[in-house]
């Protein structure tokens, strides 16, 4: 069977202070069922860029539209980047558990580098 | 066009067992998860069981009785169901879920449904 | 578990009335609703989904509403094939996928 691959197409991308960042991701399945997120770093100490179903991610908007059916891709756009905001991001698939959801699969990550603001 | 055709529906008395399948054709069957819903006579609907991949959910009331399962080289959906008592009698329907955003699932196909009837 | 509670359970109607349905859910679905119709005999078929998104092919005269613990259907004017049974459906938090209990259109 053709398992669910996770496709982050980008190794890294740089983007100048103060601009946007795009960061790709996109899925080859709908199943298992359970959501998808975005976090900054691996590990116990990652940090939750973006979870649709709850929190709050002000400077995150989805490049697809939140209503579109059956959507595949899942990539991100930052605003207004920082030189903090500099790391390496997963695309993460879950798989839905009870109480809680299992991590599944999750993509290469792509390592946002910032430049600065060009004077 | 998607269709859905639900098939193994009869009579059986309590305690006894069927298998329920659902053939799927008109879309790229091996992406998407599948569902029962079932319908008493003159009642509203009741989700039973859905499946993704190799991960499957079930209602309290038919887990542990029921097993949902899939070829996806067959694009078949089956449903398993062991230990049936007179509640049990309903349509069953077979349904492809459609998710929306990042996570959540509905229904936007359904099949005529199968009746099952449990009586001794 | 979420419990869906649709209100009224039947509704007598005229053609061409205006018609409106709720969906009260026992706890916050965000917009995670959908919207089912069913004619007797038959299999139900989506109307709604995300509160207020028409499937493909379902008339403008059907629309979605609310967010939260509230929503809302409407059909603008109401047409003869319109009766049936309306279900709203929660898919937020799951398992089990809950349905409200359903509002039956009867036509006058």
């Known amino acids: 069977e053709d398992e669910l691959q996770v496709i982050q197409p980008e190794k890294s991308v740089s983007v100048a202070a103060g601009e946007s960042a795009t960061l790709r991701c996109a899925m080859t399945s709908l199943i298992p069922v359970g959501p998808i997120m975005w976090f900054r770093g691996a590990g116990a100490g990652r940090e939750l860029i973006y979870n649709q179903k709850e929190g709050h991610f002000p400077r995150v908007t989805t490049v697809s539209e939140l209503t579109k059916r059956n959507n595949l891709d899942f990539s991100i756009s930052i605003s207004n980047i920082t030189p903090a905001d500099a790391g390496t991001y997963y695309c993460v698939k879950f798989r839905k558990g009870s109480p809680d959801d299992v991590e599944f699969k999750s993509g290469a990550g792509t390592e946002l580098s910032v430049r600065a603001k060009p004077s | 066009e998607v269709q859905l055709v639900e098939s193994g529906g009869g009579v059986v008395q309590p305690g006894g067992s069927l298998r329920l399948s659902c053939a799927a054709s008109?879309?790229?069957?091996?992406?998407?998860?599948m569902s029962w819903v079932r319908q008493a006579p003159g009642k509203g609907l009741e989700w039973v069981s859905t499946?993704?991949?190799?991960?499957?959910y079930y209602a309290d009331s038919v887990k542990g009785r029921f097993t949902i399962s899939r070829d996806n080289s067959k694009n078949t959906l089956y449903l398993q169901m062991n230990s049936l008592r007179a509640e049990d009698t309903a349509v069953y329907y077979c349904?492809?879920?459609?998710?929306?955003?990042?996570?959540?699932?509905?229904?936007?196909?359904w099949g005529q449904g199968t009746l099952v009837t449990v009586s001794s | 578990e979420i419990v869906l509670t649709q209100s009224p359970a039947t509704l007598s109607v005229s053609p061409g009335e205006r018609v409106t349905f709720s969906c009260r859910a026992s706890q916050n679905v965000r917009s995670d609703i959908a919207w089912y119709q069913q004619k007797p005999g038959q299999a139900p078929r989506l109307l709604i989904y995300?509160?207020?998104s028409r499937d493909t092919g379902i008339p403008d005269r059907f629309s979605g509403s609310g967010s939260g613990t509230d929503f809302t259907l409407t059909i603008s004017s109401l047409q003869s094939e319109d009766f049936g049974v309306y279900y709203c459906?929660?898919?937020?938090?799951?398992?089990?996928?809950?349905f409200g209990g359903g509002t039956k259109v009867e036509i006058k």
């Open positions: 995300a509160a207020s």
């Open positions: 349904a492809k879920d459609s998710t929306v955003g990042w996570s959540g699932d509905f229904f936007d196909y």
């Open positions: 459906q929660q898919y937020y938090d799951w398992p089990p996928f809950t």
């Open positions: 499946i993704g991949a190799d991960d499957t």
């Open positions: 008109g879309f790229s069957f091996s992406i998407y998860a």
